[in-house]
Interface confidence: low
């Protein structure tokens, strides 16, 4: 492979915004490999060496009054300017989440399971995901992947609830996000559709069978009782 | 007080590869980068270009300065080379996986330097290039780099995928595997027993009940035909 030594220069011109553009901090940062060696901080107003490596630059740049004036003005001419240009598609960008709930493991009822609330494709990253069991918030046994950046201006997160699902329980994943006017909820019931249809079929069949049996016995015995006085000669050969 | 938003104009120049990058970052997402070869602005999302513009030529001038700076710093540091930091690699999907529902595999390459990496998608061990895309090198707060690679795919139980990453910090290529995890249906023992018993009892009940109803009705009819003595 290519084993030649590598040399890397990085420059980061940073704009930090607080309360919109009310307070802005500008940083002009220079790095050799990963080591920052000199920086201009708008809170300081001049270049400062971060390591000994940057001392000559701090001295050289601080001697250039035009350069310093340009950097001191950068909070307005560069930061606030760029914020204004990009605000509509960055700061104001809103994409609502898609929410899906499913069990991580396919376990029978009354066994330990992880209920997954998958929240996908949202922007910005600030989000609140809560779990409820039968309307009561579950705070213990909640595990999250944390915020995952997809690299395409969307985020995703998985929030899991460790639980022992019992028949008839209703689990709710509630999501709050800047794109939503009211919380988004998705329910999960502690029984699968196939299990539910099996139970319904079984119980339904059983009840229907009992009804038929009951009706049959009722009709049969009612007729037997109703005609008992007329029967003695009925079986004469 | 924590800042609400951060915009970073991030640049780098790497020798002896003579590779440079110029990009704008908003809260960790790329707004655009400049394609050095084509000398043009490339917006991360197409719609961004409808709201703003950037003169790519300015980025080339900045990179020229970064290059000169690097030569000075290389010499000033007595030619101290960079220490390779190998990447951490994660493969995930864009959304929950459903069979035959289009999805996207994401290979997230993180916490590495220098910003040179070779990434290959493999389907069943063979390289895939159709539809693949990638981001440029994205800056991190610790001044290492991040990068995303994407592969659109149709989930199936037959296919397995790998993201293969080569970096000077790795002794050998790193492969991160992904395959469809088909959920095995629940045993549903109780439900099965209830269903079987219920339907059996039900069926038996219906048959016996029907027999009794028929017999009962016949008996009633016979008595009526004979009438009173």
């Amino acid at each position: 492979g290519d084993t030649r030594p590598r040399f890397l220069e990085q420059v980061k011109h940073e704009c930090h915004f607080f309360n919109g553009t009310e307070r802005v901090r500008f940083l002009d940062r220079y790095f050799y490999h990963q080591e920052e060696y000199v920086r201009f901080d708008s809170d300081v107003g001049e270049y400062r060496a971060v390591t000994e490596l940057g001392r000559p630059d701090a001295e050289y740049w601080n001697s250039q009054k035009d350069l310093l004036e340009q950097k001191r003005a950068a909070v307005d001419t560069y930061c606030r300017h760029n914020y204004g240009v990009g605000e509509s598609f960055t700061v104001q960008r809103r994409v609502y989440p898609e929410v899906t709930v499913y069990p991580a493991k396919t376990q029978p009822l009354q066994h330990h399971n992880l209920l997954v609330c998958s929240v996908n494709g949202f922007y910005p990253g600030s989000i609140e995901v809560r779990w409820f069991r039968n309307g009561q918030e579950e705070k213990t046994g909640v595990v999250s992947t944390g915020l995952i950046q997809n690299g395409d201006w969307t985020f995703q997160t998985l929030v899991m609830l460790e639980t022992v699902p019992r028949s008839g329980e209703v689990y709710t994943c509630q999501v709050e996000h800047p794109s939503l006017t009211s919380p988004l909820t998705v329910e999960w019931r502690a029984r699968s559709e196939s299990a539910q249809s099996k139970m319904l079929s079984g119980v339904g069949g059983f009840v229907l069978g009992l009804l038929f049996l009951g009706a049959g016995l009722f009709i049969y015995f009612r007729n037997q009782k109703g005609h008992s006085g007329l029967q003695p000669t009925g079986f004469l050969s | 007080i924590k800042e609400e938003h951060v915009i970073i104009q991030a640049e780098f120049y790497l020798n002896p590869d003579q590779s440079g990058e110029f990009m704008f970052d908003f809260d960790g997402d790329e707004i655009f980068h400049v394609d050095m070869a084509k000398k043009e602005t490339v917006w991360r999302l197409e719609e961004f270009g409808r709201f703003a513009s950037f003169e790519a030529q300015g980025a080339l001038a900045n990179i020229a300065v970064d290059k000169a700076n690097l030569e000075i710093m290389t010499k000033r540091s007595n030619y101290t080379p960079i220490t390779n930091v190998p990447p951490e690699v994660t493969v995930l999907t864009n959304s929950p996986v459903e069979l035959r529902e289009p999805n996207v595999l994401i290979c997230f390459i993180d916490k590495f330097t220098p910003p040179v990496v070779n990434v290959t998608w493999l389907r069943n061990g063979k390289p895939v290039t159709t539809g693949v895309s990638e981001t440029v090198f994205l800056p991190r707060e610790d001044h290492l780099f991040r990068k995303f690679h994407y592969l659109p795919f149709l989930p199936s139980t037959e296919d397995v995928y790998d993201c293969r990453v080569e970096h000077w910090g790795l002794d050998e290529p790193l492969l991160k595997h992904w395959e469809f995890d088909a959920p095995s249906p629940l045993p549903e023992t109780t439900e099965n027993v209830v269903c079987a018993l219920g339907l059996t009892v039900g069926l038996v009940g219906i048959i016996i009940g029907t027999i009794f109803i028929i017999k009962g009705v016949r008996k009633s009819n016979a008595a009526e035909r004979r009438g009173p003595l």
Epitope: E59, Y60 | A64, V65, K67, A68, I72, K75, R76
Partner: antibody
Framework: QVELKESGPALVKPTQTLTLTCTFS??????????VGWIRQPPGKALEWLAL???????YYSTSLKTRLTISKDTSKNQVVLTMTNMDPVDTATYYC????????????WGQGTLVTVSS | DIVLTQPPSVSGAPGQRVTISCSGS????????VTWYQQLPGTAPKLLIY???QRPSGVPDRFSGSKSGTSASLAITGLQSEDEADYYC?????????FGGGTKLTVLG
């Protein structure tokens, strides 16, 4: 403002050693990234780079003239000195000193030049 | 040593556009930035273009530079009589500065 001025003999004999001094003002050779170089131009011909000294005393020489050239600096006097041994009539030229700024690659300020004739 | 190749001369009438080419190799122009100097008769060279296409303050925007691969070019639009001079391209690698042979620009008429 930045100024550079070359000084030295106008006439040297073949085989002799030429010593040229560049005295500058408006910048310091202790400033990171700054260098001072020498370039010559024979009458009616092209510019030819000879040597350069950096702020940190690193020295660079033209490959074809390396064995004959020596460059040095005196930061306190704001001077750079170039010596060239074994002079020959083909070395007759105008010798310029010039500043290479922090972002190396160009010479942004030049002296007026001094004509050196090599003749017996 | 002349490492970069320039045409010995170019000419143009006032108001016209002229270009001067400069050809090098992967190790100089291909890997680094190009500088252009103007040398008026009897004077020292003056910096005209640096970093391929950047103009120092005071240089008219009639002068522009570009680079592609291992070649560079200087374009002068709206030619004026005072543009008559010698033009030199220059590049470098880590420790060697290299010049072109120079191009004499003649303004006709």
């Amino acid at each position: 403002q930045v100024e550079l001025k070359e000084s030295g003999p106008a006439l040297v004999k073949p085989t002799q050693t030429l010593t040229l001094t560049c005295t500058f003002s408006g910048f310091s050779l202790s400033t990171s990234g700054v260098g001072v170089g020498w370039i010559r131009q024979p009458p009616g011909k092209a510019l030819e780079w000879l040597a350069l000294i950096d702020w940190d005393d690193d020295k660079y020489y033209s490959t074809s003239l390396k064995t004959r050239l020596t460059i040095s600096k005196d930061t306190s006097k704001n001077q750079v000195v170039l010596t060239m041994t074994n002079m020959d009539p083909v070395d007759t030229a105008t010798y310029y000193c010039a500043r290479s700024p922090r972002y190396r690659g160009a010479f942004d300020y030049w002296g007026q030049g001094t004509l050196v004739t090599v003749s017996s | 040593d002349i490492v970069l190749t320039q045409p010995p001369s170019v000419s143009g009438a006032p108001g016209q556009r002229v270009t001067i080419s400069c050809s090098g190799s992967e190790s100089n122009i291909g890997a680094n930035y190009v500088t252009w100097y103007q040398q008026l008769p009897g004077t020292a060279p003056k910096l005209l273009i640096y970093d391929n296409n950047q103009r120092p303050s005071g240089v008219p925007d009639r002068f522009s530079g570009s680079k592609s691969g291992t070649s560079a070019s200087l374009a002068i639009t709206g030619l004026q009589s005072e543009d008559e001079a010698d033009y030199y391209c220059q590049s470098y690698d880590y420790d060697h500065y290299v010049f072109g042979g120079g191009t004499k620009l003649t303004v006709l008429g």
